[in-house]
């Protein structure tokens, strides 16, 4: 619940907020979970903590990992985890699905596309906007503060929109880009190639040995009733039923949910009494429908209990 996925591109700025909230007066300590090493607060460091924010200026692929934040008050401590993944820049125009922020839908009356995470940064207008890597031109596109407005939305406006802005920190400028898909609402339903919302690709989930753990595979498939959409788990490339470990079971049936008007399915994998050998397995979340199949992988790591108060 108090873990958050964050991602960015190498050589860009990335700012991550602690998933545990507190009053501004509370102190927040940040640690690199794997080593339990404290993150410095001095701004001369490339990676430094600034209250509730963890700043990578700029980010490097080697920064990927789980960061722990502890919000300290006189009466309690609250612990949160930021799972940060920094990716290499793609050589081609395609933005892979693991770099995408949540899909937004628009219609003729409402076609705002907000630039994801921009409120975390110190930026000044105007924003630059691109669709499928092409700079947006023409009077139909209007950049307003932190969002883009498209006039007279048409189905052809659907696609991947990237916002680009500059973060300023103590006089130094850092580039930031963020991409999300925009779909055009239609009264009729439609289906899409599966989009896995959770887990993030190559996610590391922290678990405690001897305790129970749940993994959720969640994917969206389009709008309206979806025909032959499914999500499921595999262990080391094998169906759960064929793997033969009774402690690891897939929930019966798939839960339907809706996210931004899209039809989504969830499948929970329950691991009872987590054992050391479970950390060696690869857990694959598969999403498939009539358009195709996509998979994301999760591995488990042993939780490093820093905070016994929360």
């Amino acid at each position: 619940k108090f873990s958050k996925q964050s991602w960015g591109l190498e050589n860009e700025a990335l700012i991550v907020r602690c998933p545990r909230q507190g009053k501004p007066s509370y102190t927040v300590d940040w640690y690199y979970s794997q080593t339990n090493k404290s993150i410095p607060t001095q701004e001369r460091n490339r990676v430094f903590a600034s209250g509730q924010l963890l700043k990578f200026l700029p980010a490097a692929v080697a920064d990927s990992g789980i960061y722990t934040c502890i919000v300290r008050s006189p009466t309690f401590n609250r612990t949160g985890y930021a799972n940060v993944t920094i990716y290499k820049k793609q050589s081609d125009c395609n933005v892979p699905d693991y770099l995408m922020y949540s899909t937004v839908s628009g219609s003729e009356k409402n076609s705002k596309i907000y630039c994801p995470t921009i409120d975390l940064y110190n930026w000044t207008a105007p924003l630059e906007w691109f669709k499928n890597c092409q700079a947006l031109q023409g009077s139909r596109y209007r950049a307003h503060k932190s969002f883009l407005v498209i006039d007279n939305v048409m189905t052809e406006d659907a696609g991947d929109y990237t916002c680009k802005f500059i973060h300023n920190e103590n006089g130094a400028n850092y580039s930031v880009t963020a991409t999300r898909s925009f779909t055009v609402k239609d009264e009729q339903g439609f289906s899409l190639f599966p989009v896995i919302g959770a887990p993030a690709q190559n996610e590391i989930k922290e678990v405690e040995i001897g305790k129970n753990a749940n993994l959720t595979c969640s994917a969206c498939f389009g709008k309206g009733t979806q025909f032959l959409a499914a999500v499921l788990w595999q262990l080391n490339g094998t169906k759960i039923t064929d793997f033969g470990e009774p402690r690891i079971q897939q929930e019966e049936g798939q839960n339907q949910s809706f996210s931004n008007g899209l039809a989504c399915l969830d499948m929970v994998l329950r691991i009872a009494d987590v054992k050391e050998e479970d950390l060696l397995l690869q857990y694959d979340c598969l999403a498939l429908n009539l358009h195709g199949l996509r998979r994301h992988t999760v591995r488990l790591s042993r939780k490093n209990p820093i905070d016994h108060h929360s």
């Epitope: 990716y87 793609q90 395609n94 892979p96 693991y98 690709q201 190559n202 032959l228 499921l232 595999q234 080391n236 490339g237 094998t238 690869q282 694959d284 598969l286 498939l288 009539l290 195709g292 199949l293 996509r294 998979r295 994301h296 992988t297």
Partner: antibody, heavy 119, light 107 residues
């Protein structure tokens, strides 16, 4: 022993049709996804199509979508590829392959059957 | 679609040599990467799946490594029967795609 045996290849004119078959033995055919992969003369491998064990899911490469249809008959342990509106660029050896792990990888392959599209 | 590239496209080596072939995906594919060997006039044969797991019956001189976008197939000591063409293939998402192949021939 797992065996896959393709048949049905031959010479056909552009615009013509052909139906390939793949007879499977040595495993529980209905439990596996099955695929067709082709190889043009002197070229690399190209995935063509796959079908799930339940026949619910059928996927195609863009180059054959709308022209080729994959199907299976579990009672006969046979995989099929119906090829219509054939083009010269469809000339290739067509392999049938068994999938592991929901299109994870191809662990067994047939010996292939040659399809030649020429006028 | 995910594009796969391989290098080199061909190489000449001697029996006993250590041979390394690389495969690169156009986007992140975790470890959903498989390697196949194909000899002239024959069907491909699975060598390695999941980037590094050796298929049953494949000699241990073959090994695979890598994750994300960059992968490697290594033959620690080339044997006469290893002269063939090697293909990588991604299975992260459809359409499934193969690399163009690397031909290993006798020096």
């Amino acid at each position: 022993e797992v065996q896959l045996l393709e048949s049905g290849g031959g010479l056909v004119k552009p615009g013509g049709s052909l139906r390939l078959s793949c007879a499977a033995s040595g495993f529980t055919f209905s439990s596996y996804w099955m695929s067709w992969v082709r190889q043009a003369p002197g070229k690399g491998l190209e995935w063509v199509s796959s079908i799930s064990g339940t026949s619910n899911y059928m996927y195609y490469a863009d180059s054959v979508k709308g022209r080729f249809t994959i199907s299976r008959d579990d009672s006969k342990n046979t995989l099929y590829l119906q090829m219509n509106s054939l083009k010269t660029e469809d000339t290739a050896v067509y392999y049938c392959a068994r999938d592991r792990g929901f299109l994870g990888y191809f662990d067994y392959w047939g010996q292939g059957t040659l399809v030649t599209v020429s006028s | 679609d995910i594009q796969m590239t391989q290098s080199p496209s061909s190489l000449s080596a001697s029996v006993g040599d250590r041979v390394t072939i690389t495969c690169q995906a156009s986007q992140y594919i975790s470890n959903y990467l498989n390697w196949y060997q194909q000899k002239p006039g024959k069907a491909p044969k699975l060598l390695i799946y999941g980037a590094s797991t050796l298929q049953s019956g494949v000699p241990s001189r073959f090994s695979g490594s890598g994750s994300g976008t960059d992968f490697t197939l290594t033959i620690s000591s080339l044997q006469p029967e290893d002269f063939a063409t090697y293909y990588c293939q991604q299975s992260q998402s459809t359409p499934l795609t193969f690399g163009p192949g690397t031909k290993v021939d006798i020096k």
